[in-house]
């Protein structure tokens, strides 16, 4: 019979041959061969693989860093990751919580619309037209540009997000 | 690396005043914004004050206004919190942090004990 050029579900091609693949948990030791079933080893003590693999080696459990304000939400399995979460009061910098911070900043262009408390970070806004962010900041509110008509001066060069306006004298018409 | 080191702390009654120090080093201080934050017994962080790398703007939770005032001093690389008026309820680990507000610019506080 020909050799297979593709493999069923949960199997996988090797020397024209389709082997099986080993199950979450389990790492390859050996090749199937005409003869013998694919050899799977399960994962030690703090190592997984979550999918069905042919992989020789299993991952490293994530490692929590307190000294990052990282705790573990979820142990990890032969099967599963570990999950870090941060430490009460703080917030992950990212979905996969790498690190944690006490409160994340506003951009320049950004305002605080709410501080952050014990459970939730910062919330930011943009800064709507006539107002003006210009600093990264954990409380500061878009602030609104300078009126320069109320100080008797005339707008030299236009706000933006991030920057206020300039004001200057009044032209002078001369005589 | 950033220290971050707080001191001033210690047991005041009520009513009374302190004013609390963080002292940073290994890294600039001007510029930056400064938080003050406390941990009471039991209970979660709370955010007490902050002031703009400026110095130009500063915030205070409702729990502290009109009795805490922030302040900062960039000659000595050294922020400030005057407490007056202290009541029970202000007995916490008082921290100081800087931003980017990692736990690497994160002191290890100074305990204020408001008791008679």
């Known amino acids: 019979p020909e050799p297979p050029t593709a493999c069923r579900e949960k199997q996988y091609l090797i020397n024209s041959q389709c082997c099986s693949l080993c199950q979450p948990g389990q790492k390859l030791v050996s090749d199937c061969t005409e003869f013998t079933e694919t050899e799977c080893l399960p994962c030690g003590e703090s190592e997984f693989l979550d999918t069905w693999n042919r992989e020789t080696h299993c991952h490293q459990h994530k490692y929590c860093d307190p000294n990052l304000g990282l705790r573990v939400q979820q142990k990890g399995t032969s099967e599963t990751d570990t999950i870090c979460t941060c430490e009460e009061g703080w917030h992950c910098t990212s979905e996969a919580c790498e690190s944690c911070v006490l409160h994340r900043s506003c951009s320049p262009g950004f305002g605080v619309k709410q501080i952050a408390t014990g459970v939730s970070d910062t919330i930011c806004e943009p800064c709507p037209v006539g107002f003006f962010s210009n600093v990264s900041s954990a409380f500061e509110k878009c602030h609104p540009w300078t009126s320069c008509e109320t100080k008797d001066l005339v707008v030299q060069q236009a706000g933006t997000n991030k920057t206020d306006v300039v004001c200057g004298p009044q032209d002078r018409l001369r005589a | 690396e950033v220290q971050l080191l707080e001191s001033g702390g210690g047991l005041v009654q009520p009513g009374g005043s302190l004013r609390l120090s963080c002292a940073a080093s290994g890294s600039t201080f001007a510029g930056y914004e400064m938080w003050w934050v406390r941990r009471a017994p039991g209970k979660g962080l709370e955010r007490v004050s902050?002031?703009?790398?400026?110095?130009?703007?500063?915030y205070y939770a409702d729990s502290v206004k009109g009795r805490f005032t922030i302040s900062r001093d960039d000659s000595k690389n050294t922020l400030y919190l005057q407490m007056n008026s202290l009541r029970a309820e202000d007995t916490a680990v008082y921290y100081c942090?800087?931003?980017?507000?990692?736990?690497?610019?994160w002191g290890q506080g100074t305990l204020v004990t408001v008791s008679s």
């Open positions: 942090a800087r931003d980017p507000y990692s736990f690497d610019y």
């Open positions: 902050a002031i703009s790398g400026s110095g130009g703007s500063t």
